[in-house]
């Protein structure tokens, strides 16, 4: 499963999709066994996982994945060189950073090697499929007696490409207060009560300048500020996902 296979053809993503027939489509029976959909996510622009539901296959089948970019030098499909497995059956492909081109149409082909006509070609805009790492190094500092500033860092992705969701609440609050912060990894809370204990957390997404990803990162580790003498209701500090 580690070999790279090149399937050469001009205009591959168009030509490979054709059924050589002059019969009108309504007379063609729909494929009896549709292939599972491929779902791809680019993790922090470090690697990409393209996965499919291998258990949807009626028989254990090692499906193969080939990919290419719409605008590429050699216009060839390349086989996955690092398959992911579920119960010893292929269920995904991991693609490394060098092979990720965010701003070219990504063409992915899933195929049953036993039945070459069982093939599905999908097209994806990878810039809409980026999931950043959770923000790190959350630090709190006092700007003034009652004003707090929260700062954080994001690894490997330019700050201007990210949008942040900040949530905070005090030990007296039943729900989070949340706000969107665009592109700048800091936020200030103008008025805090030093008799309360505050919890802050942040997550990020690749949106809207460099991409349109709807997927948020995981939440950062929470940070706390304020009185440690206040009696706290532990249930209020259960951080829901």
């Amino acid at each position: 499963w580690s070999s790279k296979v090149l399937m050469s053809s001009a205009n591959e993503d168009i030509k490979a999709d054709l059924i050589l027939t002059s019969t009108a489509p309504e007379h063609l029976s729909a494929p009896t066994l549709p292939l599972p959909e491929v779902q791809c996510f680019v993790f922090n622009i470090e690697y990409m996982n393209c996965t499919w539901n291998s258990s949807s296959e009626p028989q254990a089948t090692n499906l193969t994945l080939h990919y290419r970019y719409k605008v590429s030098d050699n216009n060839t499909f390349q086989e996955c060189s690092h398959y992911l497995f579920s119960k010893e059956i292929t269920s995904g492909c991991q693609i490394q950073k060098e092979d990720i081109q965010l701003y070219q149409t990504f063409v992915v082909q899933l195929q049953d090697p036993q039945k070459p006509q069982r093939r599905a070609v999908q097209k994806l805009n990878l810039q809409n499929l980026v999931i950043p790492r959770a923000p790190e190094n959350l630090t709190l500092s006092n700007l003034s007696e009652s004003q707090l500033e929260l700062r954080w860092k994001s690894r490997h992705i330019k700050e201007r490409c990210l949008q942040y969701l900040v949530q905070y609440r005090s030990n007296r609050d039943r729900s989070w207060t949340e706000l969107i912060v665009n592109h700048e990894p800091r936020f200030s809370l103008p008025s805090v009560d030093e008799l309360k204990r505050y919890t802050f957390r942040v997550r990020s997404r690749y949106n809207p300048i460099c991409g349109s990803s709807q997927q948020w990162s995981k939440w950062s580790q929470p940070v706390h500020w304020g009185s440690h003498t206040v009696e706290e209701n532990p249930s209020l500090f259960a951080l829901e996902a």
Partner: nanobody
Framework: QVQLVESGGGLVQAGGSLRLFCATS????????MGWFRQAPGREREFVAC???????FYADSVKGRFTFSRDSAKNTVYLQMNSLQPEDTAVYYC????????????????????WGQGTQVTVSS
């Protein structure tokens, strides 16, 4: 079951425009990837354009910049706006639908589509 009905085809002079419609009945389009394909007499069926229900659209190189794919989910209709038509665009145009779980899935392979319309004839005269 999804029924697809195309309309909007016709005879047009080279350089002209047409707008094709694909109306669906029986099911909302909100979880379907949609595609347009065409077939000229004696030719292979050809991918024209496709989209995902998340809003990504893709085009064959031969139509890029001239054709625009759009959908109106409220009306359960997809459209293909065709501008600067050329005689080589003459074909029967088919609309197709494929149920998908993921908002980002767009299929350019005809064998990925479960549902097809009857087609509408587009003739471009020189």
């Amino acid at each position: 079951q999804v029924q697809l009905v195309e309309s909007g085809g016709g005879l047009v002079q080279a350089g002209g425009s047409l707008r094709l419609f694909c109306a669906t009945s029986g099911r909302t389009l909100s979880r379907y990837a949609m595609g347009w394909f065409r077939q000229a007499p004696g030719r292979e069926r050809e991918f024209v354009a496709c989209d995902s229900w998340g809003g990504d659209t893709f085009y064959a190189d031969s139509v890029k910049g001239r054709f625009t794919f759009s959908r109106d989910s409220a009306k359960n209709t997809v459209y293909l706006q065709m501008n600067s038509l050329q005689p080589e665009d003459t074909a029967v145009y088919y609309c197709a639908a494929a149920p998908t779980s993921f908002a980002t899935t767009a299929y350019s392979s005809s064998n990925s589509y479960a549902y097809w319309g009857q087609g509408t004839q587009v003739t471009v005269s020189s």
